[in-house]
């Protein structure tokens, strides 16, 4: 009868570091000839075990007895499999050559070895500078390593998901597989608190997919916005003015006073009012006195926030005489958005 | 280098038992099938017993099935060869020999001689 | 009596090639070795697997195969060649391990 080659799997997935059994039956013993394993077809195949002694096959054995003169089971296991172990194996039964090398006459189905190499830890990196809310920023995932090449990537904003995200699944051997995904998000004022979670599901996890973060409080600037007010002080001749620096986001604040365009004052903050939105508040307090002045000064509040352009806010302290010895001070709204303090001087 | 040294030899009576043994060194002992090979004085060479690796399968011809039994312990790296019921025809220089893939020989020992006789 | 056939004897002198033939194992089935002894030693393995020599054995010792026919070839005999020669089997339709009778090599002069 016809001899047969049976590889009962056509294919068996095991975990990278564990063992892989490849099964290899063969229904006669004659014709006399050595069975072989080959990884891959044709001309590109390439030996892996053959039941000749005297070779060397680090790594793989033989399942059963080989040496029983009655044996028909050629099955061989690998040991420590790697992801390079990938691929399809033949098990080859050859009869012995008169003149010429032994010849091939029966190949089995074939066996397709899958190795399980579970995916990285996802990295998820963010811009390499802040935005501000209204642009639209890239988040990229990146996870390494698995196999096989099927995996599922989701991207998940305060736990909704997310589209207009691209990703792609390379390979420099076809052996494992890496993934990067890039999302676009556009960044609203509320985002401070916000993350972005990149969910990576693959067979190996079993069930428990691997998440890498990005916190949008490490990419987002909401910049100040700026008001200055007044307090007037008794004695008369002594204005408080205050610059209130509101809603802003991260920390990083420097404000400086000018009078007529030189600088008077520099604020280093350390201490700030925090928000419910994630964002902070700072007031600034100048003292002036209006006595030394006896023209308009212009007061400007000047904020560097996070190395951006400075913004400013301007208030001009104007003053004029009155012949009375007491001293009067009003606000006069001005369209530029300058307020306008008159102030009445003591004569002496 | 690969070894093979039998002892055990020597007279018995026609009916009696005798047990040889083979010791191995050398090669993976464990991982090789062997054979016992008989050469009657001045005659040819006779396999008479073969033995798979792990010692779970047994071979004889018919001349000798039945009254030799071959086994072997991987442990202590050593062939034996139990012969009962011997007779007169069973006198030879008995080799221990390591089977190839193919259950030729690759490598003998020195041999024994057994001697049976009345 | 010997399952496999070959020469009681051959002679040759020195320099010349010697061929020993083994004939009467079933091509299908049979895996052949040669084999050489000496008065007095244990046998040693000239060739298996029909045609394959161990590193230890000189290149002069030959195997070759033709149907079921095998043949030994020693090329350049020398003096110390002189020896029996075995033809060994493997069945694997039996699995037995048959041998010739053994064959006289003479090398004259």
């Known amino acids: 009868k016809e001899l047969k080659v049976t590889q009962a799997d056509k294919s068996v997935s095991v975990a990278a570091g564990d063992s892989a059994t490849l099964n290899c039956t063969v229904s006669s013993l004659t014709p006399v000839g050595p069975i072989k394993w080959f990884k891959g077809e044709g001309q590109n195949r390439s030996p892996i075990y053959s039941f000749i002694g005297g070779e060397h096959f680090p790594r793989i054995t033989n399942v059963s007895d080989a040496t029983k003169r009655n044996n028909m089971d050629f099955s061989i296991c690998i040991s420590n499999v790697t992801p390079e172990d990938a691929g399809t194996y033949y098990c080859v039964k050859f009869q012995k050559g008169i003149v010429e090398p032994d010849t091939e006459i029966k190949s089995g189905g074939g066996t397709t070895l899958y190795v399980l190499a579970k995916p990285s830890s996802p990295e998820v990196s963010g811009p390499d500078s802040r935005g501000s809310p209204g642009q639209t920023v890239n988040f990229t995932c990146k996870s390494y390593g698995f196999s096989p090449r099927n995996i599922t990537l989701k991207w998940l904003k305060d736990g909704k998901e997310l589209s207009h995200l691209e990703t792609t699944i390379s390979s420099k051997s076809n052996v494992s597989y890496n993934i990067s995904s890039t999302v676009s998000v556009k960044l609203s004022p509320e985002d401070i608190h916000s993350r972005v979670i990149c969910e990576v599901a693959h067979v190996t996890l079993e069930g428990r997919p691997l998440n890498g973060t990005a916190n949008f409080s490490n990419i987002i600037r909401v910049s100040p916005t700026l008001k200055i007010t007044q307090q007037p002080l008794t004695p008369a001749s002594q204005v408080n003015l205050t610059c209130q620096v509101q809603k802003f986001y991260p920390k990083a604040l420097q404000l400086n006073w000018l009078e007529n365009g030189n600088l008077s004052r520099t604020d280093k903050p350390e201490h700030f009012t925090d928000n419910r939105d994630g964002t902070y508040n700072y007031t600034s307090l100048f003292l002036v006195n209006s006595s030394a002045h006896r023209e308009d000064v212009v007061f400007t509040c000047q904020v560097e926030h996070d190395s951006q352009p400075a913004i400013t806010e301007n208030h001009t302290v104007r003053a004029f005489a009155h012949s009375s010895s007491g001293g009067s001070m009003e606000t006069i709204p001005d369209n530029n958005a300058y307020y306008n303090w008159n102030h009445h001087h003591h004569h002496h | 280098e690969v070894q093979l040294v039998e002892s055990g030899g020597g007279v018995v009576q026609p009916g009696g038992s005798l047990r040889l043994s083979c010791a191995a060194s050398?090669?993976?002992?464990?991982?090789?099938?062997m054979s016992w090979v008989r050469q009657a004085p001045g005659k040819g060479l006779e396999w008479v017993a073969g033995?798979?690796?792990?010692?779970?399968?047994?071979y004889y011809p018919a001349s000798v099935k039945g009254r030799f039994t071959i086994s072997r312990d991987n442990s202590k790296n050593t062939l034996y060869l139990q012969m009962n019921s011997l007779r007169a025809e069973d006198t030879a220089v008995y080799y221990c020999a390591r089977e190839t893939w193919n259950h030729l020989f690759d490598y003998w020992g020195q041999g024994t001689l057994v001697t049976v006789s009345s | 009596s010997y399952e496999l056939t070959q020469p009681p004897s051959v002679s040759v002198s020195p320099g010349q090639t010697a061929r020993i033939t083994c004939s009467g194992g079933s091509y299908s089935s049979y895996y052949y070795a040669w084999y050489q002894q000496k008065p007095g030693q244990a046998p040693v393995t000239l060739i298996y697997s029909d045609d394959k020599r161990p590193s230890n054995i000189p290149e002069r010792f030959s195997g070759s195969s033709s149907g079921t026919t095998v043949t030994l070839t020693i090329s350049g005999v020398q003096a110390e060649d002189e020896a029996d020669y075995y033809c060994g089997g493997y069945d694997q339709s039996s699995y037995t391990n048959p041998f010739g009778g053994g064959t006289k090599l003479t090398v004259l002069g």
């Open positions: 050398g090669f993976t002992f464990s991982s090789n099938a």
């Open positions: 033995i798979s690796a792990g010692g779970s399968d047994t």
